[in-house]
Interface confidence: low
């Protein structure tokens, strides 16, 4: 006869491991007992259990409550056992020794491999700001046994670097994703992908990129200076900028206080019917947590009568 077993039994942490040991004997042969032991190299054999054809299963104290026979029906030639709730420390070499009558003793070894699925964590790097050089966007760490694979899935251009730390029974892999921050990256997903033989499918953790920036400010409304004349209604200046976080706006006048009747409404400065006292230098101040910008314009309110007089003078002077 001969023993049938597996070279390697692989199980995920917390699952039950079936350690197979089946005696394929000739007609009339019987199995008297099956002894299971752990036989890691450099260490003495540690008994797990003894399976006796007459007296049943005896489990050694170190494995009390963790070793069982498979559920019935059972073949009397089957010396397989179940190791309940496998933990990392269970990984190693196991031996079954089968005593048969009349053929004598047989033994076989198998290796138990306990997969420890990783629970990845993603840690964002420091705040990303436009204008920075190559900056850490995020790091992703996963620890498992065997070592997991950590990669990145993103449309964003960047560079990755990985390092691995070996522990006694597992390995931790950390991958970092570096990029040069730009405003176009805002809202883009950066996904850490962890692969491992103990996972039915890859684990993915997504981080949404936020890049602080503030665009240059400009003022609209003065494109046609001729519209800024005494008596005009509805004149307004609008400050243009964009940023992340969204910016706030403030209006001031360089050469004095804002004239009475001028309304500040966020990015817009609204004027009452224009008079010459509205002439001046106006400053739009744009700011967010990242930066601040200024843009200034000169308003020159025209007096149509003065202008026509000036024009005559200019003509006569020529």
């Amino acid at each position: 006869g001969e023993l049938e077993t597996s070279d390697v039994v692989t199980v995920v942490l917390g699952q039950d491991a079936k350690l197979p040991c089946f005696y394929r004997g000739d007609s009339g042969e019987q199995v008297g007992q099956v002894a299971w032991a752990r036989v890691d190299a450099g260490e003495g054999a540690q008994e797990l259990a003894l399976l006796h054809s007459k007296y049943g299963l005896h489990v050694s104290p170190a494995y009390e409550g963790r070793v069982e026979q498979p559920p019935p029906p059972r073949n009397p030639l089957d010396g397989s056992v179940l190791l309940r709730n496998a933990v990392q420390a269970d990984e190693g070499e196991y031996e079954c020794r089968v005593s048969t009558f009349p053929a004598g003793s047989f033994q076989a070894r198998l290796r138990l491999r306990v997969l420890v699925p990783p629970l990845p964590s993603l840690n964002p790097g420091p705040a990303l700001e436009e204008g920075q050089g190559l900056t850490l966007a995020a790091s992703c760490t996963a620890e498992g046994s065997p070592a997991p694979s950590v990669t990145w899935d993103t449309e964003v251009k960047g560079t990755t670097s990985s390092r691995s730390f070996k522990h006694s029974r597992s390995a931790a892999v950390t991958s970092e994703f570096h990029l040069v921050p730009s405003r176009s990256m805002n809202g883009q997903p950066l996904t850490c992908v962890v692969s491992h033989p103990g996972l039915l499918q890859d684990q993915r953790i997504t981080h949404i990129l936020h890049v602080s920036f503030l665009a240059e400010a400009s003022v609209r409304g003065l494109e046609d200076q001729n519209l800024w004349h005494i008596g005009r209604e509805g004149a307004m200046l609008k400050c243009l900028s964009e940023g992340q976080p969204p910016p706030s706006y403030n209006w001031t006048r360089l050469d004095g206080p804002l004239p009475s009747g001028v309304r500040v409404d966020g990015d817009t400065l609204g004027f009452p019917p224009l008079t010459t006292e509205h002439s001046g230098i106006y400053v739009c101040h744009v700011s967010n947590e990242f930066s601040s910008r200024d843009s200034q314009v000169t308003v020159d309110v025209l007096d149509p009568q003065e202008d026509s007089g000036k024009q005559v003078d200019l003509v006569s002077a020529s």
């Epitope: 917390g14 699952q15 699925p117 953790i205």
Partner: antibody, heavy 119, light 112 residues
């Protein structure tokens, strides 16, 4: 958003097996830890066990010999089987989600299903 | 198993007044990762439980700021700054630091 819905028979005979299913909608079961918790009438909460979506299970030692939790990712469901039930197993059974670690406990719950063990 | 003991069993309160309840664990709930996995759940009559507080003091989204959690080690407290009618129900603490996860017996909040 993610919602959980328990289903299964409301009456089970003593010594038989209690079988319940929790359907996950509004999100994938392929992440997180998925738990069963029960509450006997007028009493407190008892955690039964969890299933990590890859199939790993862990059970409360007080029930371990009788409980099995399994997953069907294609149907976005996970199930509870509790065998050899007695009247003491009469309870409202809840399914609940935990976060990326099992102890990020129970941020989403089903509405519960009452199971009575009686002949 | 870690035993979670809640007190008082019953807490009669007046609307608009503060309320406080205690949860004690038989072992420290400080975990090796630096977190303390102590959670508070609210169960209104006829409803399923709802998590209010996780990791001692972090409020879940949608939980009114009148609820606050505090404590460390083995002693923890849930406070309601001004009780409202909708706060009636049973409050459970639960530890996730030690295996297996265990709940307290609950504190029943009722209006006087």
């Amino acid at each position: 958003q993610v919602q959980l819905q328990e289903s299964g028979p409301g009456l089970v005979k003593p010594s038989e097996t209690l079988s319940l299913t929790c359907t996950v909608s509004g999100g994938s079961i392929s992440s997180y830890f998925w738990n069963w918790i029960r509450q006997p009438p007028g009493k407190g909460l008892e955690w039964i066990g969890y299933l990590y979506y890859i199939g790993t299970t862990n059970y409360n030692p007080s029930l371990k010999s009788r409980v099995t939790i399994s997953v069907d990712t294609s149907k976005n469901q996970f199930s509870l089987k509790l065998n050899s039930v007695t009247a003491a197993d009469t309870a409202v059974y809840y399914c609940a989600r935990s976060g990326n670690y099992y102890n990020d406990a129970f941020d989403i719950w089903g509405q519960g299903t009452m199971v009575t063990v009686s002949s | 198993d870690v035993v979670m003991t809640q007190s008082p069993l019953s807490l009669p309160v007046t609307l608009g007044q503060p309320a406080s309840m205690s949860c004690r664990s038989s072992q420290s709930l400080a975990y090796s990762d630096g977190n303390t996995y102590l959670n508070w759940f609210q169960q209104r009559p006829g409803q399923s439980p709802r998590r209010l507080i996780y990791k001692v003091s972090n409020r879940d989204s949608g939980v009114p700021d009148r609820f606050s959690g505090s404590g460390s080690g083995t002693d923890f407290t849930l406070k309601i700054s001004r009780v409202e009618a909708e706060d009636v129900g049973v409050y459970y603490c639960m530890q996730g630091t030690h295996w297996p996860l265990t709940f307290g017996g609950g504190t029943k909040v009722e209006i006087k």
